[in-house]
Amino acid sequence: FKVATLYSLYVCPEGQNVTLTCRFFGPVDKGHDVTFYKTWYRSSRGEVQTCSERRPIRNLTFQDLHLHHGGHQAANTSHDLAQRHGLESASDHHGNFSITMRNLTLLDSGLYCCLVVEIRHHHSEHRVHGAMELQVQTGKDAPSSCVAYPSSSQESENITAA
């Protein structure tokens, strides 16, 4: 299976909401002993491998933010914990999964990693990730709403607040 990022860069004004999105696709083993976890975490640039370092998002770890199920079922977090931090992760039936961050501040700027982990027999772990940058801006140079830059081309797209 693979993970694709729809956008590689999100530029947002302070105070706005943004939804970062990834897509999970490819052959999926729906066996009884297979579980898929989809989650998010922060990382940093300038590493040998992108997303190899893990940091929490607004003090929440990847385990606080994960969705888990077999195959491509829809799921979403309704954790009070996540919502108290202005976060919500969700997944649909088409392999898309996202994290919504509300009321952005400059501290939210950075590299975000989406991750799919396949676990067999509750033991062995196979993982694939995607990465995207969030830039939160303030002042006269900030856009009026979030602008997303696609991963494959230079065309930008305005995205409405979540």
């Epitope: 929490p56 770890t61 606080d64 033991h123 062995s124 196979h126 993982r127």
Partner: antibody, heavy 121, light 112 residues
Framework: QVQLVQSGAEVKKPGASVKVSCKAS????????INWVRQRPGQGLEWIAR????????YYNEKFKDRATLTVDKSTSTAYMELSSLRSEDTAVYFC??????????????WGQGTTVTVSS | NIMMTQSPATLSVSPGERATLSCKSS????????????LAWYQQKPGQAPRLLIY???TRESGVPDRFSGSGSGTEFTLTISSLQSEDFAVYYC????????FGGGTKVEIK
């Protein structure tokens, strides 16, 4: 840099308990599992248990599940292993080690320097 | 539990010579989804903690000299030190992380 620093050597009597600490620095403590591994004199390595500091959830080797207790203090980025009902065969060097897994198992990329625990009457 | 068996227990080698260490697992540690072998090698010197050398059976950890190489798949693995340096005399452990964690008994590489 990423580092795990363990507490000093301990001498205990049979039947007592020992609590070994492992202080992490240089990375996000809450996001990586901490494992405990022991090495008896002249012997190989034996996995005891692991804990995910973010949640405090711990997972134990069956052999140790009744005697080992793992805890963390997130405020000081410190993991602890307490081993109770000590016997002479628990004399060993105890290591903490970080692993890079998310939900399964992974190799150990960073190790503490080890804590020698001697059990003797 | 997957059992790991290392051989020989002790290997006597002269500096500059090649050392070949063996590790066998009681069942395959190859994961079908990604075709990776969940096997690592560590080096341990007296009074020190183990140090990660190799993971995924053949990937060298950052900073590990290229005289160390890992090979094998499924149940049989080899750690090769192409030309032994004085600092390489130590005990070497293999470690499977496919299903919980188990280590081999170790191979001590000593000066001949």
């Amino acid at each position: 840099q990423v580092q795990l620093v363990q507490s000093g050597a301990e001498v205990k009597k049979p039947g007592a308990s020992v609590k070994v600490s492992c202080k992490a620095s240089g990375y996000s403590f809450t996001d990586y599992y901490i494992n405990w591994v022991r090495q008896r004199p002249g012997q190989g390595l034996e996995w005891i248990a692991r804990i995910f500091p973010g949640s405090g959830n711990a997972y134990y080797n069956e052999k140790f599940k009744d005697r080992a207790t793992l805890t963390v203090d997130k405020s000081t980025s410190t993991a602890y292993m307490e081993l109770s009902s000590l016997r002479s065969e628990d004399t060993a060097v105890y290591f903490c080690a970080r692993d890079d897994s998310f939900y399964g198992y992974w190799y150990f990329d960073v190790w503490g320097q080890g804590t020698t625990v001697t059990v003797s009457s | 539990n997957i059992m790991m068996t290392q051989s020989p227990a002790t290997l006597s080698v002269s500096p500059g010579e090649r050392a070949t260490l063996s590790c066998k697992s009681s069942q395959s540690v190859l994961y079908s989804s990604n075709q990776k072998n969940y096997l690592a090698w560590y080096q341990q010197k007296p009074g020190q903690a183990p140090r990660l050398l190799i993971y995924w059976a053949s990937t060298r950890e950052s900073g590990v000299p290229d005289r160390f190489s890992g090979s094998g798949s499924g149940t049989e693995f080899t750690l090769t030190i192409s030309s032994l340096q004085s600092e390489d005399f130590a005990v070497y452990y293999c470690h499977q992380y496919l299903s919980s964690y188990t280590f081999g008994g170790g191979t001590k590489v000593e000066i001949k």
